[in-house]
Amino acid sequence: GCLTQLYENAFFRGGDVASMYTPNAQYCQMRCTFHPRCLLFSFLPASSINDMEKRFGCFLKDSVTGTLPKVHRTGAVSGHSLKQCGHQISACHRDIYKGVDMRGVNFNVSKVSSVEECQKRCTSNIRCQFFSYATQTFHKAEYRNNCLLKYSPGGTPTAIKVLSNVESGFSLKPCALSEIGCHMNIFQHLAFSDVDVARVLTPDAFVCRTICTYHPNCLFFTFYTNVWKIESQRNVCLLKTSESGTPSSSTPQENTISGYSLLTCKRTLPEPCHSKIYPGVDFGGEELNVTFVKGVNVCQETCTKMIRCQFFTYSLLPEDCKEEKCKCFLRLSMDGSPTRIAYGTQGSSGYSLRLCNTGDNSVCTTKTSTRIVGGTNSSWGEWPWQVSLQVKLTAQRHLCGGSLIGHQWVLTAAHCFDGLPLQDVWRIYSGILNLSDITKDTPFSQIKEIIIHQNYKVSEGNHDIALIKLQAPLNYTEFQKPICLPSKGDTSTIYTNCWVTGWGFSKEKGEIQNILQKVNIPLVTNEECQKRYQDYKITQRMVCAGYKEGGKDACKGDSGGPLVCKHNGMWRLVGITSWGEGCARREQPGVYTKVAEYMDWILEKTQSSDGKAQMQSPA
């Protein structure tokens, strides 16, 4: 299953499959997730080691048993790949690292006014993988405001150095934020020239294209079909690049198919997995296991659940079957692709779905009337769980926020439905940033069921929580995916990085905002909060957040929206925006429904009709 916990001061011994330099443990974990054989990783921050060569070292590891011995190492961070972790799987990495220079091939230098502008330039350059920016206070005047766009053979820095007044980061192309745009066309009977960066075997051009999209240096590809004239080259997928970023030439060639990486697509990237099943095809590879199962779909599920399995063949040969069950061959290879593809067989083959980010139809948990005042504009995909609850009577208007917690579930505040309990009048918009982008053609979700907490009473602040079941499940994308829930009764975690988001009023007597706002707000103890609200009872099922001096808060229109906190690189839904005295007033924190206290209720209500829990614990 999905394991998300990180181990501080621990290093996995042995099992190395690759090593690289990464700026932090989260990026190291992402590289492990996308490496075909990596199950575990260990990361050495700069502070953990004196050896300059090993600083920022990211060590990717494999293990037949799924685990390795841990040795104590001060400062080291270790953890698991996020394979099988559904919506948490993403190649998108937005963080900017201060005081760090990520080395690589510098192929472009320009003067810009901010690190954000430098990141934008990298994202909009087809060859840029990462960048470094010298701030205005950099010690050498001639380098100040320099934005260096970089690449490397593996897509990660060739070295990382601690350097004052330098900020570094990665391209946001994997976040589907590139302005370049992409070529969706696939060209038949056409072979591209230029430099081959890798060669893999694939059953079709679609798989070849997806592999190209997620390969750090692939810009375009050529695929040789299974009827290509040279037998040894059949099903070969050549991943390619060029200096210019486009093919310098193409040759008409029967039974070849060419196309481009989709990494530069805006708003939508293909999933990093291949779910199609190929009848009459055998995938060859290293044997991991053989099991008897009933049907090719069960074989695929078995492969997906066995974390080391990369692809499978389900044999229908009479000697491989007994009763209704046949042999399911679970296989793997060094590069994650079959080492041999044979046609005209009695088998059906396919790939593990361990990297599919749709995951299962669950909400995400972890095992371990009020808008934003004093906030700033959010950017695309920054808060992909945020939804807008709108009511359509004669006109249509935004009323509340909400948080996507599963394919078919939204968590919000009960008071949003005061006087408006009819599900037909509500429209739920997900994957949006600007309310003005909503037109009559914008897709929205309708409500199948509103589940208000049984102890909620109108005009009281207690149990201000409601679940919305959507009529149809939503697909996950970089702009629309769920927030993980805390573990039941989560009291031990100290959250220091918390944010509230919403389209609500920017002042007490204001109006709904167009762009989703965000504000960083510290949590306040319940004791402190109770002192500020002596006329009300602040229960242990509430959580408060705000600045003593005020100035930043949620406000009207933010109700039901998320209070999220980042811990160990993972965002969790800590609170639901509920109530407060005015907005952003001095010594009047915002009050939020404490989600951890309602985990039993959420679990119970999100159970499917067959009794299978719709919740999933990644840990």
Partner: antibody
Framework: EVQLLESGGGLVQPGGSLRLSCAAS????????MMWVRQAPGKGLEWVSV????????AYADSVKGRFTISRDNSKNTLYLQMNSLRAEDTAVYYC????????????WGQGTLVTVSS | DIQMTQSPSSLSASVGDRVTITCRAS??????LNWYQQKPGKAPKLLIY???SLQSGVPSRFSGSGSGTDFTLTISSLQPEDFATYYC?????????FGQGTKLEIK
């Protein structure tokens, strides 16, 4: 030039049988998956059956499963559809089609042969 | 089986009009979607493959887009020869299925 030519259609009584053939030329027949698609009078296209390049794998639409059998003879460059227990709703123009390699669309179609099931 | 739902079922338009036909799959089919044009008494003809790639010889006024479950065929400026029936077809599952068709008629 790729050509697909269906034959074997005609009038048959309900419960009867018919065997359709599709003669292929102009390409390496044994390298391609082949299929049958039908179209009832005034209605849309309905996929009927597919057979893999070697003939080892087949699949059928639910509406014909257990009654129709797809087969091929790669030495004769011919695709077949054996239709048993025919019903009035099987009345249609039957097309054979070639599936493109690596992209899964039907790039070449025959002209179709009409099968009429009526008493 | 994967169901393919086309809309509208029929459409009246004039020469020069921009026309859009949509196709929705009952589950995600990635880019495994093709569009065909069929004229009365003729076999279907491939227009678009892999959701957005134009088959060679097909005029550039035809274009396709979409991935996952929602797909669109657009004819940017209708010509007299474009009045026909259009079908989408998924090839994600080996049990291939077509949409029910959209009949494009002259207004």
């Amino acid at each position: 030039e790729v050509q697909l030519l269906e034959s074997g259609g005609g009038l048959v009584q309900p419960g009867g049988s018919l065997r359709l053939s599709c003669a292929a030329s102009g390409f390496t027949f044994s390298g391609y998956d082949m299929m049958w698609v039908r179209q009832a009078p005034g209605k849309g296209l309905e996929w009927v059956s597919v057979i893999s390049s070697s003939g080892g794998n087949t699949a059928y639409a639910d509406s014909v499963k257990g009654r129709f059998t797809i087969s091929r003879d790669n030495s004769k460059n011919t695709l077949y559809l054996q239709m048993n227990s025919l019903r009035a709703e099987d009345t249609a123009v039957y097309y054979c089609a070639r599936e493109s390699s690596g992209l899964y669309y039907f790039d070449y179609w025959g002209q179709g042969t009409l099968v009429t099931v009526s008493s | 089986d994967i169901q393919m739902t086309q809309s509208p079922s029929s459409l009246s338009a004039s020469v020069g009009d921009r026309v859009t036909i949509t196709c929705r799959a009952s589950q995600s089919i990635s880019s495994y979607l093709n569009w065909y044009q069929q004229k009365p008494g003729k076999a279907p003809k491939l227009l678009i493959y892999a959701a957005s790639s134009l088959q060679s010889g097909v005029p550039s006024r035809f274009s396709g887009s979409g991935s996952g479950t929602d797909f669109t065929l657009t004819i940017s400026s209708l010509q007299p020869e474009d009045f026909a029936t259009y079908y989408c077809q998924q090839s994600y599952s080996t049990r291939y299925t077509f949409g029910q068709g959209t009949k494009l008629e002259i207004k």
